[in-house]
């Protein structure tokens, strides 16, 4: 029986060019976490195996850093990074728990503020 729950950072926003930490936390279960897969839509970003460490998918090697903990750091953000991210906790014996994070990447604050100026 799956008793665990995943807490995530939920809906988050970050500036273009900046970085963001994606975090999930599995609680309320004594199941052994064997592996955490991080996915964006249907693309693998990274894997953290409890015994064997981290694997970053080749297409994200330049912009993804492992950690902190089982989390993931995305760097050099672009507006194309906007979307859904999933932390998939593979546990034994419970099975799979999935958490969802929605990331919105915004234009830099300079551009935002500039758009708000009004000509008197």
């Amino acid at each position: 029986m799956m008793t665990g729950t995943i807490e995530t950072t939920g809906n988050i926003s970050a500036e273009k060019g900046g970085s963001i930490i994606l975090q999930c936390h599995l609680s309320s279960t004594t199941a052994q976490v064997t592996q955490v897969n991080w996915e964006q839509q249907d693309q693998l970003l990274a894997i953290c195996n409890a015994d064997l460490g981290w694997h970053i998918s080749p297409s994200f090697k330049d912009r993804v850093a492992p950690g902190p903990g089982l989390g993931l750091t995305l760097q050099s953000l672009t507006v194309n990074d906007t979307g859904e991210y999933f932390c998939i906790y593979h546990t034994y014996p419970d099975g799979t728990y999935t958490g969802r994070i929605f990331l919105e990447v915004l234009e830099s604050s300079v551009a935002e503020h500039g758009a708000r100026f009004q000509i008197p």
């Epitope: 897969n37 593979h90 099975g95 799979t96």
Partner: nanobody
Amino acid sequence: EVQLVESGGGLVQAGGSLRLSCAASGIIGTIRTMGWFRQAPGKEREGISLITSDDGSTYYADSVKGRFTISADNAKNTVYLQMNSLKPEDTAVYYCAWTTNRGMDWGQGTQVTVSS
């Protein structure tokens, strides 16, 4: 229904070799990793080797590095574990596990016993 069937376990003397196979059928979703775990009596299940589907990267636990080799035949949906220079402390039930974008599936396990 997903089925993972391991074979190749058995009794071997210390210093000997075995090759484990794990054939998968009915896999749903996109395969992410294929790996081998083991569980000795009274101990937790531990990951000992992993191969990724994106670029074939391989990872090993320190306890088996240099002795065990993981490989995969994608056409046959089969993953292998070549185990050389076996030690009594390698005695355990060995399980294969595949992860997809949907979940994780386990084999039923195959017993490996290394006698001294």
